[in-house]
Structure formats: C-alpha cells, structure tokens
C-alpha cells in the first residue's frame, strides 16, 4: 500500500477581500480512517479553521461533496475573505482515535489578501501661513494588502518631489497604512491652489485614489492698503478712502480713528471675490474739516484674520481749505506700515 | 437510491457453513469501510465483522477463525464466509456501510436470518 | 475491547416528554460514539455520529452531546413514532462495540 500523502498543490494564493478563497487539498489513500483538518499556521498556537468531524465553521464549506469518500479531495473554500483571514494554511490528515493522532501536514498554502487602499485623506496645517512660507500636508491611507503601494503628490497638476512616505509596519501584516508628508511652499496666487495625494495600488485596477486639500484652508494673503482723498466739498466735508486689497480670507474687520479715537468699525462682509480668490474692500470717511482748528489724524486700522492690527494713517490739513481742492493737496501720509503695505496716498 | 440487500441467510446444523451476501447499489462498496452486525432475537446488536477499503480485515473475537470477510468489486457485493457455526451465532445479520471518513456507520441492511440448529 | 454502559436499560414516558439516555464508555473515545433507534422488527437506523451531529434527514428533536467516556442522547418531545429501543455505539478502535440497549416505552 502507498504512503499516504497530503498534497497542497498551490504554494500561495491571493484573493480580493470580499471574495471567496479555495484552498486545494488532495490525499493519496483513503486509508487510514480519520478526519482532515485545516489550520492557520503550525505549532501549538495553530489556529483550526476547519474539522471535518465537528464544530461550527460557517464561513468554510468542503469543496467536493464530503459524503462522496472516494474522491480524496478535501479542499475547502472560504467565503467573505478580509485582510485577517491571510497566512500559511495547512491541510493535515490524523488517524482516528483518542486522541487523534496527526499523521501528514501538506505543505501549506499562503493565502495573501488584496485589500483596496481606504480613500487617502489629506489634512493641511493647523494655523494659516503666508506666501512664501512652506506648510505641511498629510496624506493617509488605510487597510491595504499587499504592502506594495505609490504615492504621488500634486500641485494644481503639477508632480511635487518634497515629500516623504512611511508604509506601516515594516515587517509582515495583513494590513498595511500609509502616511505621507509633503513640503509646499505657499504663493500669494494660491488661493484657488489644490494639493493632491494620489494612491495606486494592485487593487485598484489602474485607476488610483485621490484625496484632495484646498491651500485657501491653508493661506493668509495679507491686505495692502491704501488711502485716497477727494476734492474738498462746498460744505467743508473731505471723503477719505482707505483701500483694503488683495487679502485672503475674507474675515477682516476695520476701524477708523480721527486724532486716536474711534470713529467707526466695520466688518468685511460678502465681498466680490477677484480672479485669484482674494478680496478688496474699500471704506470711506467724510471728515468735517470746518469742525476741526487743528490738522486731522486720520488712521485706518486693519485687523486680518486674528492677525495683529496694521495701521496706516494720513493727516487732512485744515488751514487754508481751497474750495476746489485737487486730490491730495491738503492731506499729507504720515503712515509708517509694515508688511507691504504701501506708503503714499494714492 | 443508496441501498444494502443481505440474502443467503438460512437453517444451518452446528459445525455447518454458510455465505452471506450483500449487494450495495447507489454507491461503490469498495470507497468504503464495510460491516457485518448481528442481533440474536430479543438481544442487543452486535459487531462482527469489517473490511477495510485496502482489504484490511477485522473480527470479533468470538468469530476469529471462523469467518471471512470479503468483497467483489466487480459485482459491488459484500460476503461473510461463516463456518463451524455454533448455536450462539444463530442471529439476524446486518451488512452496514461505514461513514466518508470515520466509518461511522450510515446505512443498514435490511438483515437476513442465520440459524444454527440441529 | 472498549465497554459500553447504557442507562437506564428501560424508561418510561410520555408523548411530549423530553428524554435522556445516557452511555459511558469504558476508556477515553474521544467523540466517535453513535447513537441508533430500532424498532421491533426492522434494521437499526443511524441517529447520531461523532457524538453530536446528526445523519441527514433525521429531525432536530434528537441531539447529542458529549466527549471522552460520558454522552447523552436526548429528544427534545417525544412523539408516537419515537418510542423504540436506542443503542450507542464505540467506534474509534475496533472491535466496535454497542451498549446493551434502552428501551423506551408509552407510559
């Protein structure tokens, strides 16, 4: 009588998570008598994954037809495959008895698991910064097998090359995670700017994940300002404009001082947006110059986005009001401004 | 259908000879482990005998020597040779297929009747 | 040869009763232990096999436990049909052996 033998005859099989998985197994000899079992692994801590004789195995069925004993097939087939069912599964066949005694192991099939990449998410920087300036943006994704993956980043379609890529855990796992970091330099144009993370993997058939950020989440534009006057009125009334442009986000609030006190405060509010996806607003005071003996102080004050203050003053001479004065001849800029926020008064 | 037919069952003197058959259709007699099981009137059953799929063959103790188990694959049947039969193995005898894989035993003949007497 | 000890060798009951037998083994069996119904007259019939799992086509009302040397064979309600004699069987060494019987009888 031939030796029995237990053949595995695939070394290594890999199914799509969802999908069913048959694991082929073949004895040689019906003899001697005794049940087939299935596990994961070897040694003590093996996992059973099917008895033939007992227990309760409701995502694995027999192949073959289990009361038909002259076929010595006793592959099995598992259903609803996920990412925790991979690992080396061993067809072992024992010999009836008490116990059963273990009397030949195939030599196991590898199941590895293809599991599609989770859709990647990209997270931009906690705080706004400004052009010129570089912000980090996360990419991650989850839960995909095998461990081979690409990651690309890009710049309104443009390919970025300063960015890093982890893939997690290092060493085998049903499942695996990546997270990349990618380095931007910010520009006052990038606005309407998006950056994309862009994921393929074997599973995806050749059409990658892309998760997207906005830069307008991660920008600041800063105003600049600037002042006009308009001609002296017939009753003795100057209208000073103060000129907030090109800022981003919209949230902006501006106050009017005359000689350091308060005039009036008003908040940015549905505005036009500009081609770039910046702001203007333009507000105006009318000043009294009959009411005032001396020179007017004027400042705009303007407060971005939490930011600190920026100030830009101007000052309405009222000696000598010609009735049809030309803009600008009887105000002098005394502004002192930081951050590009340019002098002069027109 | 799966079915067992025993015959060839009958009177038999002591020290005689006796050969019971039984045909199995619906299934190949030889993919699987075969028995012999009896019942004398008003007893309990029995194992006398069985015959392995490579032709291993087992016995009760009591038969040792006096029975042979065999088989004919060609006609799917199954025979127990009885000889110097005693008055203790008058019974009715069960031809039984044992199970797939454990030899459990599954389906039963409808028995045929050995009486050994003088 | 491995014993086999049915208890209680006859019973008495009633239609819609639920019913024990028990059977002990004399040395370890592990789970190869069967259970057989046979009525007066006719073949034995396979219930139960590897101490719980029951043959195809035989109701739910019969279930099996145990392991090692003690088993238990119970009907859930006991209808008209089911009053017979029951036998467990040893199979895991031969020779096979089978308990004495338990007779269930109408009260």
């Known amino acids: 009588e031939e030796e029995l033998q237990v053949i595995q005859p695939e070394k290594s099989v890999s199914v799509a998570a969802g999908e069913s998985a048959t694991l082929n197994c073949t004895a040689t000899s019906l003899i001697p008598v005794g049940p087939i079992q299935w596990f994961r692994g070897v040694g003590p801590g093996r996992e059973l994954i099917y008895h033939q004789k007992e227990g309760h195995f409701p995502r694995v069925t027999p192949v073959s037809d289990p009361t038909k004993r002259n076929n010595m097939d006793f592959s099995i087939r598992i259903s609803n495959i996920t990412p925790a069912d991979a690992g080396t599964y061993y067809c072992v066949k024992f010999r009836k008895g008490s116990p059963d005694v273990e009397l030949k192991s195939g030599a196991g099939t590898e199941l590895s698991v293809r599991a599609k990449p989770s859709a990647p998410v990209v997270s931009g920087p906690a705080v706004r910064a400004t052009a010129e300036h570089t912000v980090s943006f996360t990419c991650e994704s989850h839960g995909f097998s095998p461990r081979d993956i690409t990651l690309k980043w890009f710049k309104n379609g443009n390919e970025l090359s300063d960015f890093q890529t982890n893939v997690d855990p290092a060493g085998k796992s049903v499942s695996y995670s990546i997270r990349s970091t990618a380095r931007v330099v910010l520009t006052r144009r990038d606005v309407h700017s998006q950056v994309i993370c862009e994921v393929a993997h074997v599973t995806l058939q050749g059409d990658p994940l892309r998760g997207t950020a906005n830069l307008s989440e991660a920008i600041r534009v800063p105003p600049f300002l600037e002042f006009t006057q308009q001609s002296m009125r017939a009753d003795n009334q100057v209208n000073v404009t103060c000129q907030v442009m090109k800022f981003y986000p919209q949230r902006l609030q501006l106050t009017w001082l005359e000689n350091g006190n308060v005039s009036r405060t008003e908040m940015a509010s549905a505005l036009p947006e500009n081609k770039d996806g910046t702001y203007n607003w333009t507000s105006w005071l009318l000043v009294n110059v009959s009411a005032h003996r001396d020179d007017v102080k004027l400042t705009c004050q303007v407060e971005h986005d939490g930011q600190p203050a920026v100030n830009k003053s101007f000052s309405v001479k009222v000696s000598a009001h010609p009735k049809e004065q030309g803009s600008n001849t009887a105000a002098e800029n005394t502004g002192t401004n930081e951050r590009n926020i340019y002098g002069g008064s027109g | 259908e799966v079915q067992l037919v025993e015959s060839g069952g009958g009177l038999v003197q002591p020290g005689g000879s006796l050969r019971l058959s039984c045909a199995a259709s619906?299934?190949?007699?030889?993919?699987?482990?075969m028995h012999w099981v009896r019942q004398a009137t008003g007893k309990g059953l029995e194992w006398v005998s069985a015959?392995?799929?490579?032709?291993?063959?087992y016995y009760t103790g009591s038969v040792k020597g006096r029975f042979t188990i065999s088989r004919e694959n060609a006609k799917n049947s199954l025979y127990l040779q009885m000889n110097s039969l005693r008055a203790a193995d008058t019974a009715v005898y069960y031809c039984?297929?044992?199970?797939?894989?454990?030899?459990?035993?599954?389906?039963w003949g409808q028995g045929t009747m050995v009486t050994v007497s003088s | 040869d491995i014993q086999m000890t049915q208890s209680p060798s006859s019973l008495s009951a009633s239609v819609g009763d639920r019913v024990t037998i028990t059977c002990r083994a004399s040395?370890?069996?592990?789970?190869?232990l069967a259970w057989f119904q046979q009525k007066p007259g006719k073949a034995p019939k396979s219930l139960i096999y590897?101490?719980?799992s029951l043959h195809s086509g035989v109701p739910s009302k019969f279930s099996g436990s145990g392991s090692g040397t003690d088993f238990t064979l119970t009907i859930s309600s006991l209808q008209p049909e089911d009053f017979a004699t029951y036998y467990c069987?040893?199979?895991?060494?031969?020779?096979?052996?089978f308990g004495q019987g338990t007779k269930l009888e109408i009260k």
């Open positions: 039984v297929r044992g199970g797939v894989w454990d030899d459990a035993f599954d389906i």
């Open positions: 069987q040893q199979y895991v060494s031969y020779p096979y052996t």
């Open positions: 590897t101490a719980s």
């Open positions: 619906g299934f190949t007699l030889s993919s699987y482990d």
């Open positions: 015959i392995g799929t490579a032709g291993d063959t």
């Open positions: 040395q370890d069996i592990n789970n190869y």
